[in-house]
């Protein structure tokens, strides 16, 4: 078979303060030495860029300096964190594995991970 | 408006070259994959070339290897591909196409024709 | 390389008939990997459906796609008068990216 298998959580609850991590691990059928992680939104039918970052296998992933994700990679396992998210945020993210090099290139799309984000209750005014 | 466009194509003696270009507007060009594609009259559709968000990787079909050369300007929202030595059997409609984030090719140009005959 | 093979090379039928392609794969891909596009004469082809059963944008549900491993099939509920045209399918999980031949269809 020559499909790359993308898995990844199907769903995770975002902590109060936005932040919500989740591992995407990918079966590579070939030995990359440069890999491509992006994580998209899927809202409907549309589907955004969140962030992307690309790797050489064994070092840690570059995400741009103003990137909401960060993340770590360990072998074919990828531990991706999105920060700075709000209640309309929630949403399907997708993980896409891409294995740019050596040839040849293959392509993983994950399920998707439902993030369920929810506000804080702004804390009541104290009348001490 | 999303879309790209062709240009560049033309009549040429076989063993000569050409360059073609393809105009992207209405999105973030280097969020994407590229991609040319190329049609013989009448026939199917043939991948002919890839290239990597930031250029850094491509890849190319047999037919073409070592004869074409694909390469873009994300500055310029600009996809181009060089082709030598080319040969009777290079005529057909080039389209460049955007690889998609869930990766078809999502959005495709007008065509540019490329016939090469002496 | 993934060799794709459709089936039939020409569908001939009337409009309201329902049209049934096929596009087998030479080895197993994934059913997220595969594409059908439509194609009419002097215009560039257009995304039909995506990751073997995914309407494209602005795609009329009366196109669905089916099918996992190695066969696909790209269905026509009710054949419109712009739906006869030529249909490709398409691998996209690997290098090369490979399409079928084509099925043409075609007004009886």
């Known amino acids: 078979c020559k499909a790359m298998h993308v898995a990844q959580p199907a769903v995770v609850l975002a902590s109060s303060r936005g932040i919500a991590s989740f591992v995407c691990e990918y079966a590579s059928p070939g030995k990359a030495t440069e890999v491509r992680v992006t994580v998209l939104r899927q809202a409907d039918s549309q589907v955004t860029e969140v962030c992307a970052a690309t790797y050489m296998m064994g070092n840690e992933l570059t995400f741009l300096d103003d990137s909401i994700c960060t993340g770590t990679s360990s072998g074919n396992q990828v531990n991706l964190t999105i920060q700075g998210l709000r209640a309309m945020d929630t949403g399907l993210y997708i993980c896409k594995v891409e294995l740019m090099y050596p040839p040849p290139y293959y392509l993983g799309i994950g399920n998707g991970t439902q993030i369920y984000v929810i506000d804080p209750e702004p804390c009541p005014d104290s009348d001490f | 408006e999303v879309q790209l466009v062709e240009s560049g194509g033309g009549l040429v003696k076989p063993g000569g070259s050409l360059r073609l270009s393809c105009a992207a507007s209405?999105?973030?060009?280097?969020?994407?994959?590229m991609h040319w594609v190329r049609q013989a009259p009448g026939k199917g559709l043939e991948w002919v070339s890839f290239?990597?968000?930031?250029?850094?990787?491509?890849y190319y079909a047999d037919s073409v290897k070592g004869r074409f050369t694909i390469s873009r300007d994300n500055a310029k929202n600009s996809l181009y591909l060089q082709m030598n030595s080319l040969r009777a059997e290079d005529t057909a409609v080039y389209y460049c196409?955007?690889?998609?984030?869930?990766?078809?090719?999502?959005?495709w140009g007008q065509g540019t024709m490329v016939t090469v005959s002496s | 390389e993934i060799v794709l093979t459709q089936s039939p090379a020409t569908l001939s039928l009337s409009p309201g008939e329902r049209a049934t392609l096929s596009c087998r794969a030479s080895q197993s891909v994934g059913s997220s990997y595969l594409a059908w596009y439509q194609q009419k004469p002097g215009q560039a082809p257009r995304l039909l459906i995506y990751g073997a059963s995914s309407r494209a944008t602005g795609i009329p549900d009366r196109f669905s796609g089916s099918g996992s491993g190695t066969d696909f099939t790209l269905t026509i509920s009710r054949l419109e008068p712009e739906d006869f045209a030529v249909y490709y399918c398409?691998?996209?999980?690997?290098?090369?990216?490979?399409f079928g031949q084509g099925t043409k269809v075609e007004i009886k």
């Open positions: 209405g999105f973030t060009f280097s969020s994407y994959t």
């Open positions: 196409a955007r690889g998609g984030h869930l990766g078809p090719f999502d959005l």
């Open positions: 398409q691998q996209y999980g690997s290098s090369p990216w490979t």
């Open positions: 290239i990597s968000y930031d250029g850094n990787y491509k």
